[in-house]
Each structure stands twice: as C-alpha cells, then as structure tokens.
Interface confidence: medium
C-alpha cells in the first residue's frame, strides 16, 4: 500500500513539475527590466527564450519573436536546448510511468516489469528536473553577470563620463517557476525510484536441497522415499520435500555410515 502511494505521489509530483517546466519554457518573463533608478519608467521590457516584449504605461504591448538563430547568444541557445531536453525526457517519463503504476493493470504485466518501468521513469524525471534547474540557473547566471556589468557601465560609461541610460535586466517570474518545477520533477523522480525498490519482487533463491538423516537410525530406501521412523507419520511412503529437508546453508551434515562408500 505504501509503495502504491509513493509511486502515485511521485507520478503526480512529476506531472506538476513537468507542467511547470513547459510553462516556464513558454513564458515571456525570463528576464525583466530593472526599473530601479531608470529615467524612462514609461516603458517596461521583458524577454523570454523565444521572444521579447515591450509594455508601456499606456497599455500598449508589443512582442517579437527571435527570428534569427545565428544572432542569438550561445547561452540562450544552450538554455533552450536544456529546457527542451527536460520536457522531452519528462514527457517520455510520464508515458512510461503511466504503464508502470501499480494501480493500473495492463494485461498480465509482471511486478518485475512494472518495477523496471518505474525505475526508468524515475531516472527520466530526475534527469528532466536537473536539465530544467541547469537551464534556469545558466540563464540566471547570465543575467547576474550582465546586471553587474551594466551597473559598472552606468558609473563609468564611455570615456569615463557618466552614461545617462543603461538598461539592466533582473530575474523574471519564469526563472522561479522553472526552479520550483525542476525541483518538483526531481523529487517526483526520487519517489519513483524509491517506489521501484518496493515494487521489485523478492528474489527467489532456488538453493540446492540435500536430505540428511535426522538421526543415525534413519535409513534411506531406494526411490527417494524417506523411511518411516518414530518421528513422522509417513506410513504410505509419500515423497517428502519438507520436514527433514534442509538447504546446504542451513544444516551442517554429520558423518554417518551412509556418507562413505
């Protein structure tokens, strides 16, 4: 029951996480204009991975997509790639985990198969979450670097004179959505991996069984039948696989007259 709950919760958490990663990737507000000490407050700029927008105090908003690939910074391309890989892996993971859910029966799928699928989806969720966190963190680092460079430029400017305008960009809402979503996907993946351990059937060890005499008075009859002694009620010479049966590991054999030829 606990395993089913862990698996189900892991699936739901990952589902929310991946939905968040998709939302973050599509959002326009990855970076927003820092309006502190900005002389032109009538205009607000914000950028996403796919387009940039301008919003004015009058309500006028205009967005334009990045129609060029060559002119874009390599870091932006890398972030796009990381987010897309995260989404693809997450989507595949979700698909796999649906079939792996213990509460869903598909044909005569064995628990071992479900366990393997759960582990696979768990690993996919973990990698997906890490991709999203990495992508958002790379972008955030890019912003922080540019922000402080811009701040330096504001006070030095061209040829040592004060530069009157310098646009600085800071963290947009998408970054926070991405971080949280990546974290949730990661947690969901870990939960799936934990659930996998509970789903995996116990290994059946078919150990070699040796039949040893319980006492010195016990004789073996041909045909593998245990001789009737005062210890058991096997009067009809039925084949016995329990009682005196012990594995090689469990019993220490004592020498008897039958052990040597």
């Amino acid at each position: 029951m606990a395993v089913t709950a862990c698996q189900g919760l892991g699936f739901v958490v990952s589902l929310i996480g991946i939905a968040g990663i998709i939302a973050a990737t599509c959002m326009d507000q990855w970076s927003t204009q820092d309006l502190y000490n900005n002389p032109v407050t009538a205009v607000f700029n914000y950028q996403g991975l796919w387009r940039s927008c301008v919003r004015e105090s009058s309500g006028f908003t205009e967005c334009r997509g990045y129609f060029t690939l060559l002119g874009l910074p390599a870091m932006l391309q890398a972030v796009r790639a990381l987010m897309i890989v995260g989404i693809v892996l997450g989507a595949i993971g979700l698909l796999v985990s649906i079939f792996a859910l213990k509460c869903i029966r598909i044909g005569s799928m064995e628990d071992s198969a479900k366990a393997n699928m759960t582990l696979t989806s768990g690993i996919m969720f973990i990698v997906s979450g890490l991709c999203a966190i990495a992508g958002v963190s790379v972008f955030a680092n890019m912003l922080v670097t540019n922000f402080w460079m811009s701040t330096a430029n504001m006070y030095t400017g061209m040829g040592g004179m004060v530069q009157t305008v310098q646009t600085r960009y800071t963290f947009g809402a998408a970054l926070f959505v991405g971080w949280v979503a990546g974290g949730l996907t990661l947690i969901g993946g870990v939960m799936m991996c934990i659930a996998c351990r509970g789903l995996a059937p116990e290994e059946t060890n078919y150990k070699a069984v040796s039949y040893h005499a319980s006492g010195h008075s016990v004789a073996y009859k041909p045909g593998g039948f245990k001789a009737s002694t005062g210890f058991g009620s096997n009067t009809k010479n039925k084949k016995i696989y329990d009682g005196g049966a012990r594995t090689e590991d469990e019993v220490q054999s004592y020498p008897s007259k039958h052990d040597y030829v």
């Epitope: 940039s52 997509g65 060029t68 540019n146």
Partner: nanobody, 118 residues
Framework: DVQLVESGGGLVQAGGSLTLSCAAS????????MGWYRQAPGKQRELVAD???????NYADAVKARATISRDNAKNTMYLQMNNVKPEDTAVYYC????????????WGRGTQVTVSS
C-alpha cells in the same frame, strides 16, 4: 554588429530650425526606446527627448516647447525636429537605442555636432 548613424547636424542660425535623423544599421532589430541625448563642452550628457515603440514621448524641459521627436518602427529610424534653436543648443547630439531583440542592450551613435550661431 549594430551601428546607429546620426545625420542632419551642422551650423544653424539662431532662431532657425534643424532636423536630426538616426538610423539603425539593421532593420530587423526590435528597438523598444529610441532617443536623443546631447553633450555640450564641459557638461554631462543629458536627455533631449525619447520615444517608445507605441509613440509615447518624453522631452527635456529645455526643449519641450520647441522639439518634436518621431520614429518609424518598420525602418528603425528616428527624427528630431527643433524649431527656434538657441546658442545653448550647441552640443554633440547622440542617438540612443534600447534594443530588445534579437539581443539585448543599449546602443549609442557616434554623435553629430550641432552648432548654433548667434
């Protein structure tokens, strides 16, 4: 690389008018704000006027009644018309553009000299 090219500067008689134009070297740029700044000898650079994509304008008090700023978003060009120019308008006029796409940044032109003779 992006270049902003100013034109229209020169020697102007006091009381006369002048029109400055600024053009971006690429027409595919998404410029949110374009503006004119000026720097008189020994003084700091100051805003003359700026204009947003939506046409919202902002003027310095010194030129408010005498200047008109306009832009063509499709061509990424901007114009500044100044009437009744005064000797104190003598300065190097710089074009400024705040680019949002395909990369972000603030760009300046090399400047054009405007001299008002009395």
């Amino acid at each position: 690389d992006v270049q902003l090219v100013e034109s229209g500067g020169g020697l102007v008689q006091a009381g006369g008018s002048l029109t400055l134009s600024c053009a971006a070297s690429r027409s595919d740029l998404f410029i949110s704000i374009m503006g004119w700044y000026r720097q008189a000898p020994g003084k700091q650079r100051e805003l003359v006027a700026d204009i947003s994509r939506g046409g919202k304008t902002n003027y310095a008090d010194a030129v408010k009644a005498r200047a008109t700023i306009s832009r063509d978003n499709a061509k990424n060009t901007m114009y500044l018309q100044m009437n009744n120019v005064k000797p104190e308008d003598t300065a190097v006029y710089y074009c400024y553009a705040q680019i949002s796409n395909p990369f972000w940044g603030d760009y300046w032109g090399r400047g054009t000299q405007v001299t008002v003779s009395s």
